[in-house]
Interface confidence: medium
């Protein structure tokens, strides 16, 4: 499988466990992968009684279920950790939960941050 039309080179990066894992807390991540593999961005978060707790954001390597998704939309009904993936630079900046059961769509807007580039 070659590159998709929306080629992903950079994603929003975030790590809630940045201190423990000795990484930056937030910024931009340059995506790198094998020549014939596609690249995606992802976001993962928890929802505790309506309070959104961002877990991680970043690059995500060649995943069939992320192909050709321009927006980051989680469809799992009520998981411990919500997850979405998408294709296109910084497509994981905004992320949405749209459960299959047809509940209300909830879109999460990121707070403005000063990005630092991760390589």
């Amino acid at each position: 499988s070659g590159r998709g039309e929306a080629e992903t080179r950079e994603c929003i990066y975030y790590n809630a466990n940045w201190e423990l894992e000795r990484t930056n807390q937030s910024g931009l991540e340059r995506c790198e992968g094998e020549q014939d593999k596609r690249l995606h961005c992802y976001a993962s978060w928890r929802n505790s009684s309506g309070t959104i707790e961002l877990v991680k954001k970043g690059c995500w390597l060649d995943d069939f279920n992320c192909y050709d998704r321009q927006e980051c939309v989680a469809t799992e009904e009520n998981p411990q950790v919500y997850f979405c993936c998408c294709e296109g630079n910084f497509c994981n900046e905004r992320f949405t939960h749209l459960p299959e059961a047809g509940g209300p769509e909830v879109t999460y807007e990121p707070p403005p941050t000063a990005p630092t580039l991760l390589t």
Partner: antibody, heavy 118, light 112 residues
């Protein structure tokens, strides 16, 4: 729920199209796969298709002979099998791709049997 | 492609006793995101396969807690703490993080 159909007895070199009808979930949110099982043998991944049909992948053993497709409006997955060989004899399962982050191959159909014999 | 090898091929077990199945991959299954996408699939006689365990050790919905998965890197294990009659069947390990998905050759669990 996934229900396969279209299997049967077919002569070598002929064609057959398998269908899979999905219910109980939003079909067009998921990539889908075909996995087969020859009599008395293990599981073999055959082909996969992305949610919007833009990306398709095939096992080397069927590349150039089989075509995977889907119709999201009909909640249906298809496998067009051409130039069939005796070694294509198997039960063919339609399988939902629950997503790598979550479960992987999480919903399986009952399977449809294909026998290639003269 | 990744090759998955299971041992033993067959495992005769006494009811109520434990059973253990090993799976080894030809290369590390640790993904760049830190997760390992190794699943275990059960196939009872005459039935279609069904997902038991995902991401090494997570039980899928409805799977009894006598089933557990462990391992890392290239070596993985499925354990049944106390085998019941309904556990008879073939168990497959599967690598599902990339296409082509690859399966182990299967381990048959049968009652002695």
């Amino acid at each position: 729920q996934l229900v396969e159909s279209g299997g049967g007895l077919v002569r070598p070199g002929r064609s057959l199209t398998l269908s899979c009808t999905a219910s109980g979930f939003t079909f067009n949110d998921y990539a889908m796969h075909w996995v087969r099982q020859a009599p008395g043998k293990g599981l073999e991944w055959v082909s996969g298709i992305s949610w919007n049909t833009n990306s398709k992948a095939y096992a080397d053993s069927v590349k150039g002979r089989f075509i995977i497709s889907r119709d999201n409006a009909k909640n249906s997955l298809y496998l067009e099998m051409n130039s069939l060989r005796a070694e294509d004899t198997a039960v063919y399962y339609c399988v939902r791709d629950g997503g790598r982050f979550y479960y992987g191959l999480d919903v399986w159909g009952q399977g449809t049997s294909v026998t290639v014999s003269s | 492609d990744i090759v998955m090898t299971q041992t033993p091929v067959s495992s005769p077990v006494t009811l109520g006793q434990p059973a253990s199945i090993s799976c080894r991959s030809s290369q590390s299954l640790i993904h760049s995101d830190g997760n390992t996408y190794l699943s275990w699939i059960q196939q009872r006689p005459g039935q279609p396969p069904r997902l038991l365990i995902y991401k090494i050790s997570n039980r899928f919905s409805g799977v009894p807690d006598r089933f557990s998965g462990s391992g890392a890197g290239t070596d993985f294990t499925l354990k049944i703490s106390r085998v019941e009659a309904e556990d008879v069947g073939v168990y497959y390990c599967a690598e599902t993080s990339q296409v082509p998905h690859t399966f182990g050759q299967g381990t048959k669990v049968e009652i002695k």
